[in-house]
């Protein structure tokens, strides 16, 4: 059988390396070997390239070396497949090397902002030795923040008589690390060189790009004073690298500036301790260039109705997100502020804050929670300089069995009944929420008997017991990963009844 | 046997066409560039023009440039030569001869030189501009 | 275009004496690209050396060729009767090919 015709001949010119080309069908099932003609010198010279040895048949690709390799020009390649049955030519095909040269990439040596102008990197680079001296050079440069992992990518070209192998980069973050990396390829050729090696680079810092701002509010002690726990953080947005010296505060009763208070400080919350009224708060942070804009807060009168707009709330799981959803019969709210922390029996550890807008949902990344704790999770609607009331509802990310059962005890031990009582889990030991408890209970040498109640119950009378009987019991605690049995206890039925 | 035979000569006026033809036979034609040389009797050669194996032009004698066209029919194993605007001093026996193939001259590994040469030459075909 | 100069025009010798002929081309010409054939009255030209010093197939070893550059020589070293004939060079290095005028050696 005849080969197969070579077909999809596919070439590239390394550029002042070989002249290399690809065929179809890469095997062949009898032996073939391959013979490539070419002309080059605008066809005035003739050559070929052949896998006609024992280490090359059935390669479907070969190479012309210097010093035949000329530039600029037009070969005319054909490969012939042979094997011991015959020849198959394959269509002759043109190529023009300035459209299929590929160059070494260049080499960027320095990305540097450049003083007193804002948000730009200015990138500079070796032109590859191994390109024409005399051709454009088109550059693909692709930049993206450190901690990114999607790439930008911005065109351009650079004559030869350019020399200056520099490019501005603007329209970045101030105070940001950038990674760069660039590739480039004759202007008219359709092969890219490959990317350079990656060189990082930092705008200049500017004052701080501002700051979000929320609050906590307390009940008021026993003097009226309301404890005020402000606490912000860098606006989103805001440089990675952006660190500020410090903080000033200043806040007053509503139309009553002659009682403005300030205050500095380094931290990132604050308590203040406020009367009965409408107070307005301003925050802003500072560096050795500047301040950040304003950041406002208006914490409402202590009898003050807030509005309420959420009518439900659902949290639920995706594979790597915590989602929330909410509804709220007002359109105009577009902000909403949501606060999560980890529902402990003591006081809260963490408490985190994040806002929302021009959306109803908000998601978190599930590995930025911790599996079995329940977390409670408030979303608050914010209409301007106004806070809505919050709705609230609890999440786990990974729920678990719990770490410990009910402690348990029987009581009112009659003739043929008992009741027992259970107290609560902890919290800290549920590692789920509980759906139900079962209580298993069985007679010395009898059949076991269980009963599941939901898990608002806490006590449970047992009936139709025998009477002078011992019985040994314990209370499953369940939640959607599987149960945890309480201690066991034992009791033993009476045999008269006592009134 | 490996033959050229040439064809098409004859005798016309300054101004005047002819188109000249080569029949190849013995060898694998579109393997071979070939080329058109003449001779005046008692004159040394000159080489007029030649076509490489894919049909691409190699190329004319700068006395013949723009009047003489080379081309070639691998499916009838034929080489052409169109002559026009004849003048005096193209009268001469025009030979066809086969370039050197694609072989040989291997310089290692898988890549071979083509070595140039006219390895195998037809007997002639006479053309004379005369008025 | 390459002007290929032969010398001497003609080399008159005697059976079994070297003759020695001369290429000298008007500019470099890689030495790949660099022919010589021979001619006798009324024959086609026949090949002797290609790539300046490769005898063609068929061609005795009195025949030899070298050079590089812009000169290049065709030596036999014992002419017989057969050698003596036109003998001429020609360059494929650029276009247009070009052959020398040719040397004519004949018997003294």
């Known amino acids: 059988v005849l080969p197969a015709k070579p077909e999809n001949i596919s070439c590239i010119f390394y550029y002042e390396e070989n002249f290399t080309c690809t065929w179809s069908p890469e095997k062949e099932a009898s032996y073939t070997w391959y013979k490539v003609k070419r002309t080059y010198s605008y066809g005035y010279k003739s050559d070929i390239c052949s896998t006609d040895n024992s280490t090359r048949g059935n390669h479907a690709s070969c190479s012309f070396l210097p010093p035949t390799i000329t530039n600029p020009d037009n070969y005319t390649i054909q490969v012939e497949a042979q094997n011991a049955d015959g020849i198959m030519k394959s269509d002759i095909t043109y190529w023009n090397l300035d459209a299929i040269m590929k160059i070494e990439p260049p080499e960027i040596f320095s990305v540097k902002s450049v003083l007193g102008i804002k948000r730009m990197l200015q990138i500079k680079w070796i032109r590859p030795v191994l390109a024409p001296h005399s051709s454009t050079l088109k550059y693909t440069l692709r930049f993206r923040t450190i901690n990114s992992a999607y790439w930008m990518e911005v065109n351009f070209t650079k004559e030869d008589i350019d020399r200056d192998e520099t490019y501005n980069l603007t329209e970045l973050q101030a105070f940001t690390e950038y990674v760069m990396t660039l590739r480039c390829a004759p202007a008219e050729s359709m092969f890219w060189s490959g990317w350079s090696q990656e060189k990082v680079g930092t705008t200049e810092e500017e004052a701080p790009y501002g700051l979000d701002l929320w609050r906590v509010l307390k009940p008021a002690m026993v003097d009226g004073r309301r404890p005020v726990q402000l606490m912000w953080k860098k606006a989103t947005g805001a440089p990675v690298l952006e660190k500020a010296l410090g903080y000033n505060i200043w806040y007053f009763p509503e139309n009553n500036t002659n009682l403005t208070e300030t205050v500095n400080t380094t931290n990132q919350t604050h308590e203040l301790y406020l009367g009965g009224k409408t107070y307005w708060v301003y925050v802003v942070s500072y560096n050795s260039l500047g301040e950040s804009p304003v950041a406002t807060l208006r914490i409402p009168a202590l009898n003050e109705k807030t509005f309420q707009c959420i009518e439900a709330m659902q949290a639920c799981l995706t594979q790597d997100q915590l989602v929330v959803e909410w509804q709220s019969s007002a359109p105009e709210v577009d902000t909403w502020m949501v606060e999560w922390f980890p529902d402990v029996d003591s006081e809260p550890s963490s408490f985190s804050w994040e806002s929302v807008s021009q959306a109803r949902n908000w998601t978190i990344q599930k590995d930025e929670l911790k599996p079995l704790w329940c977390y409670n999770i408030s979303v608050y609607p914010v209409l301007r300089d106004r806070v809505g009331q919050p709705y609230s509802t609890q999440a786990y990310v990974q729920e678990g069995i719990p770490s410990a059962g009910p402690v348990t005890q029987a009581d009112s031990i009659g003739v043929k009944t008992v009741t027992i009582t259970w107290k609560e889990i902890p919290k800290s030991k549920r590692n789920g929420f509980i759906k139900n408890y079962t209580i298993f209970y069985q007679a010395e040498d009898g059949k076991e008997f269980s009963k599941t109640v939901n898990s608002n119950i806490l006590q449970y009378r047992l009936e139709s017991l025998t009477r002078r009987t011992s019985y040994s019991l314990q209370v499953m605690a369940s939640t959607n990963a599987g149960g945890t049995n309480g201690t066991k206890i034992n009791f033993k039925t009476l045999s008269i009844s006592v009134l | 046997e490996v033959q050229l035979v040439e064809s098409g000569g004859g005798v016309v006026r300054p101004g005047g066409s002819l188109r000249l033809s080569c029949a190849a036979s013995g060898f694998t034609f579109d393997d071979y560039g070939m080329s058109w040389v003449r001779q005046i009797p008692g004159r040394g050669l000159e080489w007029v023009s030649g076509i490489n194996w894919a049909g691409g032009t190699i190329g004319y004698a700068d006395s013949v440039k723009g009047r003489f066209t080379v081309s070639r029919d691998d499916a009838n194993n034929s080489l052409y030569l169109q002559m026009n605007s004849l003048r005096a001093e193209d009268t001469a026996l025009y030979l066809c001869?086969?370039?050197?193939?694609?072989?040989?001259?291997?310089?290692?590994?898988?890549?071979?030189?083509?070595?140039?040469?006219?390895?195998?030459w037809g007997k002639g075909t006479t053309v004379t501009v005369s008025s | 275009e390459i002007v290929l100069t032969q010398s001497p025009g003609t080399l008159s010798l005697s059976p079994g004496e070297r003759a020695t002929l001369s290429c000298r081309a008007s500019q470099s010409v890689s030495s790949r690209y660099l022919v010589w054939y021979q001619q006798k009255p009324g024959q086609a030209p026949r090949l002797l050396i290609y790539?300046?010093?490769s005898r063609a197939t068929g061609i005795p070893d009195r025949f030899s060729g070298s050079g590089s550059g812009t000169d290049f020589t065709l030596t036999i070293s014992r002419l017989e009767p057969e050698d003596f004939a036109v003998y001429y060079c020609q360059q494929y290095d650029n276009s247009p090919r070009t052959f020398g005028q040719g040397t004519k050696v004949e018997i003294k």
């Open positions: 001869a086969r370039e050197s193939p694609l072989r040989l001259g291997d310089l290692g590994g898988d890549y071979f030189y083509y070595y140039y040469y006219m390895d195998v």
């Open positions: 790539g300046t010093s």
